[in-house]
């Protein structure tokens, strides 16, 4: 009898009420493996969850989170609010970027400000939690002999930027 059930493919179940005939999964249910004695109820993506993939007879529905939220868990069992710019998502949730780092998106991690001096440039605009520094001309370009329509703003390295 066990052998008969093992012949039932995914999308069906082994129906004990019908001499172990392989019956198709009823609507809104699925079996992802063969030899199942019952079909599982399809997940419904409701409320903060939206449908990413419809349920089929052989696979469960897959959910995503509505705009402004992202999934937690292997099967999107929870929705977590997106972080703000100037924050990053850690194991404990959204945390402000540390001094010297920034994130200009609602996802991803905080990245270090650009080190302008590595490119032989100076800092034109200081960095913030939300924005990278803006590098300007190199200090050599700003020497008295260099032609410039307007006098340069005093440059400061990223490490001295107030938050």
């Amino acid at each position: 009898l066990q052998d008969l059930c093992s012949n039932c493919p995914a999308g069906t179940f082994c129906d004990n009420n019908r001499s172990q005939i392989c019956s198709p999964c009823p609507p809104n249910s699925f079996s992802s493996a063969g030899g199942q004695r019952t079909c599982d109820i399809c997940r419904q993506c409701k409320g903060v969850f939206k449908t990413r993939k419809e349920c089929s007879s052989t696979s469960n529905a897959e959910c995503d989170c509505i705009s402004g939220y992202h999934c937690l868990g292997a099967e999107c069992s929870m929705c977590e609010q997106d972080c703000k710019q100037g924050q990053e998502l850690t194991k404990k949730g959204c945390k402000d970027c540390c001094f010297g780092t920034f994130n200009d998106q609602k996802r991803g991690i905080c990245r270090p400000w650009t080190n302008c001096s590595l490119d032989g440039k100076s800092v034109l605009v200081n960095g913030t939690k939300e924005r990278d520094v803006v590098c300007g001309p190199s200090p050599a370009d700003l020497s008295p002999g260099a032609s410039s329509a307007t006098p340069p703003a005093p440059a400061r390295e990223p490490g001295h930027s107030p938050q």
Epitope: Q44, K46, G47, I66, Y69, S77, M78, E80
Partner: antibody, heavy 116, light 107 residues
């Protein structure tokens, strides 16, 4: 900010019905399922069921299937729970709560006392 | 249904103590575990979701850990305002189920 304001305490007779309300503010009501929780000193917290205000679709704990009826009115941002055929076992505090896979905001709670 | 067990129903501690409250599920809940605080006036607040994520506005002295069937909530430096009852809750499967609660008191 997100808030759930529940209706006031109820004293009801055995066999009667009562409808509790939960008014949401500070967020898009239709975008989140609303769940209802029962709390008693003996049994602690018990999940009653949930309603999707967008569609009116519901899920119930089998234990409460014949006891509770969940509805929602999108126009007033309010969820309702009717409790029927009340007995002393239904005396409890009832909470509504918003769902994200976890309950991030809870209502103020409504105390229901069933007594003759 | 998944059973959630908090074996310690009440706990006495001193201000400044490190307190750990445990919770066990009757089957693997794959980190789908949340913690709530209920104050004596009945107000309920989310503390931690998905095992270890701190809800916004919750002090960093609260932390959560665990996996599989065993989970815990830790308060690293107990304050007077932490006097409350703490509940765990699983979101792995319907019906959602809660632990019986652990009441925290000051020694």
């Amino acid at each position: 900010q997100v808030q759930l304001q529940q209706s006031g305490a109820e004293l009801v007779r055995p066999g009667a019905s009562v409808t509790l309300s939960c008014k949401a503010s500070g967020y898009t009501f239709a975008g989140f399922e609303m769940h209802w929780i029962k709390q008693t000193p003996v049994h602690g917290l018990g999940w009653i069921g949930a309603i999707d205000p967008k569609t009116g679709g519901t899920d119930y704990n089998q234990k409460f299937k014949d006891k509770a009826l969940l509805t929602a009115d999108k126009s007033s941002n309010t969820a309702y729970m009717e409790l029927r055929s009340l007995t002393s076992e239904d005396s409890a505090v009832y909470y509504c709560t918003r769902d994200l896979g976890y309950f991030d905001v809870w209502g103020t709670g409504t105390t229901v006392t069933v007594s003759s | 249904d998944i059973q959630m067990t908090q074996t310690t129903s009440s706990l006495s501690a001193s201000l400044g103590d490190r307190v750990t409250i445990s919770c066990r599920a009757s089957q693997d809940i794959r980190s789908n575990l949340n913690w709530y605080q209920q104050k004596p006036d009945g107000t309920v607040k989310l503390l931690i979701y998905y095992t270890s994520r701190l809800h916004s506005g919750v002090p960093s002295r609260f932390s959560g850990s665990g996996s599989g069937t065993d989970y815990s909530l830790t308060i690293s430096n107990l304050e007077q305002e932490d006097i409350a009852t703490y509940f765990c809750q699983q979101s792995e499967k319907l019906p959602r189920t809660f632990g019986g609660g652990t009441k925290l008191e000051i020694r």
